[in-house]
Structures are given as structure tokens and as C-alpha cells.
């Protein structure tokens, strides 16, 4: 999906008012310095591409993030503010249902959510120069 035509300010507002705290709660008990940010993004569409990938695509050691509350809210926000997003995701979701895993918080998942927090912070500050 091409995130170029999303309403970025509305997604930023959604993040600040409905998603950010759920990411913090997921990470509770973890030191903010525990994980290095290894995933970066260069602009808002790129950030959303990376956010979507880390949130919804199962990875080795962390297959369960898509069923977390922050993921549900991310999915809802993208569906509302990114034209055509919901249509492109229907088939993907049907496929995911077949391989649904139970929720387990692993160290790999914590690392992945730490990366997500970094991507969202970058999304919210699009005018900053890339480090």
C-alpha cells in the first residue's frame, strides 16, 4: 500500500490521543535504553510503511503484535485516514486469520515495539533531518 495520500496530521492526532500510551504500557518494566533503534524512516509515508510492517507482519521470535490493542488502533487509524487502505487489507487479514497465534510477550516483541515507538516519534517530527 502507498501511504502517500494519507491524512498525516489526523494520524498524528490519533497516535497522540489513542495509541502512544498503549505502546508505553506494553513496554512497561523495560528500560528506555535497553534496545537500540535499528529501524529508521525518512519521511511520513516511509514511516507508515515501516510501522505497518513491524506492527502487522509476523517476525521470527515475535508473531503476535497484530492482536495487541495498539495494533488494533493503528489498523483503525490507517483505515480511516488512508484512502483505499481498508480495501487492500481485507485479503491480507483473511490470510492472517488462518495463522493467528496466541498473544505472548517475548523479548523480541519488546524490541520490536521499541522500534515502533521510534518510528512513531520520527513520524511525528517529519521536518527533522535524518540522523
Amino acid at each position: 500500500y502507498d501511504f502517500t495520500n494519507c491524512d498525516f496530521e489526523k494520524i498524528k492526532a490519533a497516535y497522540l490521543s489513542t495509541i502512544s500510551k498503549d505502546l508505553i504500557t506494553y513496554m512497561s518494566g523495560t528500560k528506555s535504553t535497553e534496545f537500540n533503534n535499528t529501524v529508521s524512516c525518512s519521511n511520513r509515508p516511509h514511516c507508515l510503511t515501516e510501522i505497518q510492517s513491524l506492527t502487522f507482519n509476523p517476525t521470527a521470535g515475535c508473531a503476535s503484535l497484530a492482536k495487541e490493542m495498539f495494533a488494533m488502533k493503528t489498523k483503525a487509524a490507517l483505515a480511516i485516514w488512508c484512502p483505499g487502505y481498508s480495501e487492500t487489507q481485507i485479503n491480507a487479514t483473511q490470510a492472517m486469520k488462518k495463522r493467528r497465534k496466541r498473544k505472548v510477550t517475548t523479548n523480541k516483541c519488546l524490541e520490536q515495539v521499541s522500534q515502533l515507538q521510534g518510528l512513531w516519534r520520527r513520524f511525528n517530527r517529519p521536518l527533522l533531518k535524518q540522523q
Partner: antibody
């Protein structure tokens, strides 16, 4: 303007079935998480069920296995199929647009379901 | 999973400040929303994201949330604020949960 209109409520006997409908207008229905919330006479609000644009569904424990939520995005309509109804299911049922999977920003006017013999 | 506890009733004199609490285990780690419901009407969202006001909601409505308690504050309460108020949050099982409701009486 943004509007939700419920229909299908009425009197039904215990053990019976009823299907509620909710017609949505004024917004892109297919993009939103939609829910049913009920309120028994003189009581508080109780979330019943919700569904995403992709058909994934969520239920309160009190109705799991008896109620089925569904949607027809082409008709901008939300449904609640209620089976094996009990007296305690008597309530006003509200159709609701649940913004970002969390708070309800738009409510219908409600439809009364009475389960009684 | 989380249960939300509200006082059944709160009374306040006109012009005074009304505070309605909503308690729940580690509630501060979740977002809380508040609804106002007048007799015979559907609820209306008055606070979302703990403390944000939807457009059209008067500034006298404010919210906070930390620890195990969220609070809806109505400053300079008016007669028209008399209503039932419900807090709402969500569970780890991805379901929505409401508090039992508080009847606000303006004396």
C-alpha cells in the same frame, strides 16, 4: 450529516431470535470499526460486540455464542443476529461508530428489544 | 480483566466543581473516555484520550487519569449538566468496558 439508524427491535419470547440492523450514512462506513452497545431499563451501558472493516469480530462474554455481528459494506449496514434470547437481554440496543477501536463518537437513537413470555 | 468502578451518585451546587471518579486496576496505563447521557437520549462523548474534549463540548469539562483512578471534572457546574456520566476503557482481551455510571445531581 453523520447518522446511524437502528431497526428490528421488538418483543420476542425467551429462546427466540431477532435481527437488528443499523443503516449508516454521512461517512465512509467501510473504514470504521462499528459496535453494538446495549442499556437495560434503568441500568448502565454494556458493550455487546464490534466488527472491523475486514469482518473480524469481537464479543462480550455475556453474548458469546448467542449473538453474531456482521456488516455489509456495500449497503453501509451493520447487523446483530441475536439467538437464544434471555430476559436479561432486554435493553435498548445502540449502534455505534467506535473511533480508533476505542471511544464511541457517533451513536444511533437506539432500538428496544424486549424478551418476555 | 479490568472492571471500572464509579460512585452511583454525586451532588453539586450550581457554580461549584463536580468530580466524578472512575477506578480500575492500573487504569492509568490505559486511555479513558467519558460520556454524558440525559434521560431518553443516546450518550454523548465529553472526554476522550483521558483529557481531550471533542469539538462542541464546553471548556468546563476536563479529565485526568493516573494510577488507578480517572476523574471527570466539571467546573462551574450548570443545571444542564445534570445527567448520568459513564467512564469507558478497554481490556487486554480487546473488548470495551464501561463503568456502572454516576448520576450527577445539580442541587
Amino acid at each position: 450529516q453523520v447518522q446511524l439508524v437502528e431497526s428490528g427491535g421488538g418483543l420476542v419470547q425467551p429462546g427466540g431470535s431477532l435481527r437488528l440492523s443499523c443503516a449508516a450514512s454521512g461517512f465512509t462506513f467501510s473504514s470504521y470499526y462499528m459496535s453494538w452497545v446495549r442499556q437495560a431499563p434503568g441500568k448502565g451501558l454494556e458493550w455487546v460486540s464490534g466488527t472491523f472493516f475486514d469482518g473480524s469480530t469481537y464479543y462480550a462474554d455475556s453474548v458469546k455464542g448467542r449473538f453474531t455481528i456482521s456488516r455489509d459494506n456495500s449497503k453501509n449496514t451493520l447487523y446483530l443476529q441475536m439467538n437464544s434470547l434471555r430476559a436479561e437481554d432486554t435493553a435498548v440496543y445502540y449502534c455505534a461508530r467506535q473511533q480508533y477501536f476505542d471511544h464511541i463518537d457517533i451513536w444511533g437513537q437506539g432500538t428496544l428489544v424486549t424478551v418476555s413470555s | 480483566d479490568i472492571e471500572l468502578t464509579q460512585p452511583p451518585s454525586v451532588s453539586v451546587a450550581p457554580g461549584q466543581t463536580a468530580r466524578i471518579s472512575c477506578g480500575g486496576d492500573s487504569l492509568g496505563g490505559k486511555y479513558v473516555y467519558w460520556y454524558q447521557q440525559k434521560p431518553g437520549q443516546a450518550p454523548v462523548l465529553v472526554i476522550y484520550g483521558d483529557s481531550k474534549r471533542p469539538s462542541g463540548i464546553p471548556e468546563r469539562f476536563s479529565g485526568s487519569n493516573s494510577g488507578n483512578t480517572a476523574t471527570l471534572t466539571i467546573s462551574g457546574t450548570q443545571a444542564e449538566d445534570e445527567a448520568d456520566y459513564y467512564c469507558q476503557s478497554y481490556t487486554n482481551a480487546l473488548s470495551t468496558v464501561f463503568g456502572g455510571g454516576t448520576k450527577l445531581t445539580v442541587l
